[in-house]
């Protein structure tokens, strides 16, 4: 029971985590304009992995995609790659873990196979979570570096005559979503790995013993119980629960607060 709970919880936590990683990757608020030194700006800038947006004084928000690949910073490309790898691994992990769930019966799948699939999905979730955390952390580091660089030369202009306040960027909501989501996926993966240990059938090394009765030759082969599966060869009168696996496609891509027009 504890194994089933651990596996189920691991799956749910990972599912939430991966949904969060997808949401974070799609969000536009990876970096937002720092308003600390300029709280009265009527134009608010924020940027994502795929496009940059400007909210204007009338409330209109204009977003423009990065229509170049080669012109983008290598770090941004690396973050994109890490997040996509995280999503792909997580999605595969989810697919594998659905079939590995103890509460779902698929044919005559052995517990050892379920254990292996649970471990595989767990490792995938761990790597997926690490990819997301790494991606978000690389981006955050990039922001911190750029923030202090732009602070060093806060005002640029022609011989100090024209004051042009350089736009500084700070952490956006997507970073926090990404960190939390990555952490959840990681925790979910660890839980799956723990559940795998409880799922693995204990090997019993009894030899098959033949008892010769007069006139009859009956062989008894004691062969260890399946580890608390409830699914032996005799499934008569046993309810098989098909968990009705649903795909969680409806991850809400964060609507930019002002994208309405």
């Amino acid at each position: 029971m504890a194994v089933t709970a651990c596996q189920g919880l691991g799956f749910v936590v990972s599912l939430i985590g991966i949904a969060g990683i997808i949401a974070a990757t799609c969000m536009d608020q990876w970096s937002t304009q720092d308003l600390y030194n300029n709280p009265v700006t009527a134009v608010f800038n924020y940027q994502g992995l795929w496009r940059s947006c400007v909210r204007e004084s009338s409330g209109f928000t204009e977003c423009r995609g990065y229509f170049t690949l080669l012109g983008l910073p290598a770090m941004l490309q690396a973050v994109r790659a890490l997040m996509i790898v995280g999503i792909v691994l997580g999605a595969i992990g989810l697919l594998v873990s659905i079939f590995a769930l103890k509460c779902i019966r698929i044919g005559s799948m052995e517990d050892s196979a379920k254990a292996n699939m649970t471990l595989t999905s767990g490792i995938m979730f761990i790597v997926s979570g690490l990819c997301a955390i790494a991606g978000v952390s690389v981006f955050a580091n990039m922001l911190v570096t750029n923030f202090w660089m732009s602070t060093a030369n806060m005002y640029t202009g022609m011989g100090g005559m024209v004051q042009t306040v350089q736009t500084r960027y700070t952490f956006g909501a997507a970073l926090f979503v990404g960190w939390v989501a990555g952490g959840l996926t990681l925790i979910g993966g660890v839980m799956m790995c723990i559940a795998c240990r409880g799922l693995a059938p204990e090997e019993t090394n009894y030899k098959a013993v033949s008892y010769h009765a007069s006139g009859h030759s009956v062989a008894y082969k004691p062969g260890g119980f399946k580890a608390s599966t409830g699914f032996g060869s005799n499934t008569k009168n046993k309810k098989i629960y098909d968990g009705g696996a649903r795909t969680e496609d409806e991850v809400q891509s964060y609507p930019s607060k002002h994208d309405y027009v």
């Epitope: 304009q33 009265v40 700006t41 009527a42 134009v43 800038n45 940027q47 940059s52 400007v54 204007e56 004084s57 009338s58 409330g59 209109f60 204009e62 423009r64 202009g157 024209v162 004051q163 042009t164 306040v165 350089q166 736009t167 607060k257 002002h258 309405y260 027009v261």
Partner: antibody, heavy 115, light 113 residues
């Protein structure tokens, strides 16, 4: 087509409150944009007063901050301006406006503050 | 607050003439996020509300005749009317659209000789 129309009393006594409404047709005030009030003084000087956002948040001109309030009635698709403790200095034509770069303005309503 | 200074305060012109009016802001209205200058020009005729002419310092609003041209960057901007028509006689305002509170210039009045 989007249209804005201001309405309210044309004469207000000093120290009283000035209340104006702006009716919007052709667009829902909850769908987007900041719904803004401007005023133009007799000498033609234009002043931005403040706005109510499509999500209900406000931003006001600091020079009016403790006197101004902009609210809305989403069911009637209207937004309102309330200016407290008016003086003769508040005599102006009041405009409501919205959309990108304030492309749409109401026709304006002249409010005279006089005893 | 950002101070917008317009010059001249009035211009007396004849139809067909080229007209240039200036607007200076006390701080740069350039936004590095999208590389745009948040300076807007409005035209106001007597008894009418202001009408949007040019935004982002140089982008004409749809329906505005091509004779109206905005230019400039940072803190210095100009509005040029290549060939003034009788219907262009109005007051022209520049507006800081980058900082709250949004502020307007005092206006340039275009009058017929």
């Amino acid at each position: 087509d989007v249209q804005l129309q201001e309405s309210g009393p044309g004469l207000v006594k000093p120290s009283q409150s000035l209340s104006l409404s702006c009716s919007v047709t052709g667009y829902s005030i909850t769908s987007g944009y900041f719904w803004t009030w401007f005023r133009q003084f007799p000498g033609n000087k234009l002043e931005w007063m403040g706005y109510i956002s499509y999500d209900g948040s406000n931003n006001y001109n600091p020079s009016l901050k403790n006197r101004i309030s902009i609210t809305r009635d989403t069911s009637k698709n209207q937004f309102f301006l309330k200016l407290n403790s008016v003086t003769t200095e508040d005599t102006a034509t009041y405009y409501c406006a919205s959309f990108r770069f304030f492309a749409y303005w109401g026709q304006g309503t002249l409010v005279t503050v006089s005893a | 607050d950002i101070v917008m200074t317009q010059s001249p305060s009035s211009l007396t012109v004849t139809t067909g003439e080229k007209v240039t009016m200036s607007c200076k802001s006390s701080q740069s209205v350039f936004n590095s996020g999208n590389q745009k200058n948040y300076l807007t020009w409005y035209q106001q005729k007597p008894g009418q509300p202001p009408k949007l002419l040019v935004y982002w310092a140089s982008t004409r609003e749809s329906g505005v005749p091509a004779r109206f041209t905005g230019s400039g960057s940072g803190t210095v901007f100009t509005l040029t009317i290549s060939s003034v028509q009788a219907e262009d006689l109005a007051v022209y305002y520049c507006q800081n659209d980058y900082y709250f509170p949004l502020t307007f210039g005092a206006g340039t009045r275009l009058e017929l000789k």
